[in-house]
Every structure is written in structure tokens, then in C-alpha cells.
Interface confidence: low
């Protein structure tokens, strides 16, 4: 991380392992003042690599609900609606940060956790290895 | 949010706005014990809706570096390598949580923030209305 100068206007920390444990305000600030117009809400259906969204819920996590994408087909959908198995539908994955209650059930103590989620699917050309 | 019972083994909080401000341990626990074998590292190049990755850096944010996808074409790449403008490359976007230093430059005080990031691109059929 970046070395940040100490600032007299900052909250104090008594933690001997500081800055490993920090104070976090859970009043979420949303940087996206309006929904992005290029809305992805229906892309899961219109994509040549369509996907279904599955609800992943965990009350010990913040956010407790995360939606996971699962590609519908192994191949990609052609203009005629049939699946082309010479192409592959693959999940686009992203590592995201979540807060995990630690110790368990504690309302005000969390550990930062990285989880891998599938956000959607894309159609790729398969890697084919030809033996000489 | 979920109502969590108070637990005698939990750290105490003196914050009058509790549980809006919580303690977070920044020693990240990575739930993905091994790198996902279906790694998406080269999908950006092999996709029919390929994308470039742009580095978005902000020292006041945690994580400070986020990679943003930007679709390379308006259309989608056909098997012959040409772009088909009857189809559209669109970004798959996801809202993610980050920590924003607040007050600014403070090393041990953060606010949770939601930001919208483009993770990759997918190829979709455009919405077109034909007048009878």
C-alpha cells in the first residue's frame, strides 16, 4: 500500500497491530450517482454466450447476497438460435472484496475477504493444440 | 441487514452509531485457496467481443489498483477476423465494494464505497425495432 502521512484530524487507533485493524463506516457511499445507461440487465439473455444468475446468500458476509453467473451452454449461440460448439461460452470472473464476520456472529467485527465471482459470460475461440 | 445477537466473545464497540462503524481486519483471507484453473487471463483476447484492460489507480482507495475493461470494437469479431457490426460488443459491469479513506489521507479510517466496474465484454444481439 501507499504510505499515507499521519493526520491530526484522523481517528486514533489503540490497536497494537495498527494499521491491520481499521475503522470502517458502513454507510455506503455510491459513486455511481445514476445507473449507467449502458445497463447490463438484459445482456445475460441477449448474449451469444447467455448466462443464468444464481443467488448466493451468506448472513455471515457483507454483502450477504451476491449474484453468480453460470453460462447456459458449452458453445455459443448463433444467429439462427442454434449452439455452435466450435466456440466456447466461458465465465468472466472477478475477485471482489467482501466483509466476513469474525468471530462468527459478531455484529461489529469483520475480516476483509477476497472471493472470486462469475459476473457474466463471453464467447471465446477455443485453444486447440495441434501435435506436430 | 440481518439482526445478529450480541455475543460476549465479540470485540466491544463504543461508537454511538454502532453498528454503522465497525472494526475490520485488513489481513485479507483469500477464499480461493488455489488460482482458479479456468483462468480468464486470456479471454480478453480470445473473445468475439475482445477488450483492453485499463489501470485505474487511486491511493485513497483500497484496493488502490482496479483494472477496467473497455471493449475494443462496437461490433463482434467473426471467425474470419472481421468485425460484424450487426452484433454489439458490450461491457459486463458489476458493482463492487471498496474502502475509501475518510477523512482523506487517514491511514486507519475508511468508508465503504460501491463503485461500478467493467469486468469484460460480451457479444449481444442489438435491440432493433422494425416498423410494420
Amino acid at each position: 500500500g501507499i504510505a499515507i502521512p499521519r493526520n491530526s484530524g484522523c481517528p486514533n487507533s489503540e490497536d497494537k497491530n495498527f494499521p491491520r485493524t481499521v475503522m470502517v463506516n458502513l454507510n455506503i457511499h455510491n459513486r455511481n450517482t445514476s445507473t449507467n445507461p449502458k445497463r447490463s440487465s438484459d445482456y445475460y439473455n441477449r448474449s451469444t454466450s447467455p448466462w443464468n444468475l444464481h443467488r448466493n446468500e451468506d448472513p455471515e458476509r457483507y454483502p450477504s447476497v451476491i449474484w453468480e453467473a453460470k453460462c447456459r451452454h458449452l458453445g455459443c449461440v448463433k444467429a439462427d438460435g442454434n449452439v455452435d460448439y466450435h466456440m466456447n461460452s466461458v465465465p468472466i470472473q472477478q475477485e471482489i472484496l467482501v466483509l466476513r464476520r469474525e468471530p462468527r456472529h459478531c455484529p461489529n467485527s469483520f475480516r476483509l475477504e477476497k472471493i472470486l465471482v462469475s459476473v457474466g459470460c463471453t464467447c471465446v475461440t477455443p485453444i486447440v493444440h495441434h501435435v506436430a | 441487514g440481518i439482526a445478529i445477537p450480541r455475543n460476549s466473545g465479540c470485540p466491544n464497540s463504543e461508537d454511538k452509531n454502532f453498528p454503522r462503524t465497525v472494526m475490520v481486519n485488513l489481513n485479507i483471507h483469500n477464499r480461493n485457496t488455489s488460482t482458479n484453473p479456468k483462468r480468464s487471463s486470456d479471454y480478453y483476447n480470445r473473445s468475439t467481443s475482445p477488450w483492453n484492460l485499463h489501470r485505474n489507480e487511486d491511493p485513497e482507495r483500497y484496493p488502490s489498483v482496479i483494472w477496467e475493461a473497455k471493449c475494443r470494437h462496437l461490433g463482434c469479431v467473426k471467425a474470419d477476423g472481421n468485425v460484424d457490426y450487426h452484433m454489439n460488443s458490450v461491457p459486463i459491469q458489476q458493482e463492487i465494494l471498496v474502502l475509501r479513506r475518510e477523512p482523506r489521507h487517514c491511514p486507519n479510517s475508511f468508508r465503504l464505497e460501491k463503485i461500478l466496474v467493467s469486468v469484460g465484454c460480451t457479444c449481444v444481439t442489438p435491440i432493433v425495432h422494425h416498423v410494420a
Partner: antibody
């Protein structure tokens, strides 16, 4: 020929209202997102509002939010801008413009067709 | 004050190359594609470039566009007298939730 024709401009007192119209021809109007853009005398272009092809989504510049309303009537091939609580700083030439791609695009293909503009003067 | 910054003016003699910059931030140029418009005095704007570097049909190949990071630029090579006009960059801005125009650059052809 693809054409956009604005009308409804004029001189109006501060605090009053005005409704601009933009008649579209030569393309399937209901397929395209539409914008209003204005230009004050001697100044640069300022984006005002956009509406999706089906009218379900609308976005406004902060300077007009809560005062202006963009709407469309696809059966009449017409785009509208309802302007309330007008201020002297709203004085400008108002252009309507068409998004360059059909469907759920707001800007990616640029604004490829513009009207000739209609002048709005807000003065007491 | 526009969120997309352009130089107020640029000039060159016929045949020269003139470049116009457009500086933005992550929420606009960093994430979205840039359009360029040309406006000659007394006329409506005309789309000159979209998607950073694609010219609509009818726009001469003397005009070229590029983008890098949070900046974009328009180059006019082989400058001609009819290129004398105001040029605006534009794109979507996620923070503002709207389309934004640059401050505009007046291009003058000298001599």
C-alpha cells in the same frame, strides 16, 4: 433524407414555461435514443438531456434537473422538451440530435444527425 | 467549467497538421469512448469521429482520433481552409450521469 426539425422556441419571461418539439423523418424514430443539446450565444455546446428509444430511460444535466422534462411520442415521430421555471441562463439555441445506433445506445456511436436548432430567449 | 478540458484555440497554415487534446478523468474518457464534433459558424454541429477513432462516412481521412488513459486527441493533417471551425470532444460521464462536451477548440487556418 434523415431530418430533424425543431420548433417551439421564442422569447419568454423568467419563471415561465416553454415546450420544444423535434419532428423526425427519414428513419425509424422508435429505434433510436434522442438528445437535446443547447448552445448559449457565443458559448460552447452543453448537453441537456437524453431519452432511450422506448422512453423508459431519461437522463438530465444537473443544470436542468427538476425543471426540464424530455419525452417522446413514437407514434408521431416527435421528441419534446418541456421547460419550466425558465432562467436567463437557459437562453440558447436548442438542438435535438439522434444517436448513431439503434437500440439501447445512448452515445456510443455519437450523435450523427442534428436539427438546425430553435432559439429560446429568457428575458424580462 | 467543463469536465472535459480542451485548449481554447489551435492554428496552422494550409497543409500543416493540427492536434487538439481533450483531457478528462476515469469516470468519462477512462471508461467510455470519445466522440468529436465540428461546428462551423452559424451551423449545427456535425459528427466527425466516434468510438475514439472511427470516422462516419463522408468525413475525410485527414481527420484521425486517438485515446489513451483519460485523454483523447483529434489530429487534422493536410489542413485546409474549410477546416476552420470549432471542435468539441464529448463522451458519457458516469459520475454526472450524462453526456458531456469539452470546452471547445477554435481552429484557425492561417495565411
Amino acid at each position: 433524407e434523415v431530418q430533424l426539425l425543431e420548433s417551439g422556441g421564442g422569447v419568454v419571461q423568467p419563471g415561465r414555461s416553454l415546450r420544444l418539439s423535434c419532428a423526425a423523418s427519414g428513419f425509424i424514430f422508435s429505434n433510436y435514443g434522442m438528445h437535446w443539446v443547447r448552445q448559449a450565444p457565443g458559448k460552447g455546446l452543453e448537453w441537456v438531456a437524453v431519452i432511450s428509444y422506448d422512453g423508459s430511460n431519461k437522463y438530465y444535466a444537473d443544470s436542468v434537473k427538476g425543471r426540464f422534462t424530455i419525452s417522446r411520442d413514437n407514434s408521431k415521430n416527435t421528441l419534446y422538451l418541456e421547460m419550466n421555471s425558465l432562467r436567463p441562463e437557459d437562453t440558447a439555441v436548442y438542438y435535438c440530435a439522434k444517436v448513431g445506433a439503434s437500440g439501447d445506445y445512448y452515445y456510443s456511436y455519437g450523435l450523427d444527425v442534428w436539427g438546425q436548432g430553435t432559439t429560446v430567449t429568457v428575458s424580462s | 467549467q467543463s469536465v472535459l478540458t480542451q485548449p481554447p484555440s489551435a492554428s496552422g497554415t494550409p497543409g500543416q497538421t493540427v492536434s487538439i487534446s481533450c483531457s478528462g478523468r476515469q469516470s468519462n474518457i477512462g471508461r467510455h469512448y470519445v466522440d468529436w464534433y465540428q461546428q462551423v459558424p452559424g451551423a449545427a454541429p456535425k459528427l466527425l469521429m466516434y468510438y475514439d477513432s472511427i470516422r462516419p462516412s463522408g468525413v475525410p481521412d485527414r481527420f484521425s482520433g486517438s485515446q489513451s488513459g483519460t485523454s483523447a486527441s483529434l489530429a487534422i493533417s493536410g489542413l485546409q481552409s474549410e477546416d476552420e471551425a470549432d471542435y468539441y470532444c464529448a463522451t458519457w460521464d458516469d459520475s454526472l450521469g450524462g453526456y458531456v462536451f469539452g470546452s471547445g477548440t477554435k481552429v484557425t487556418v492561417l495565411g
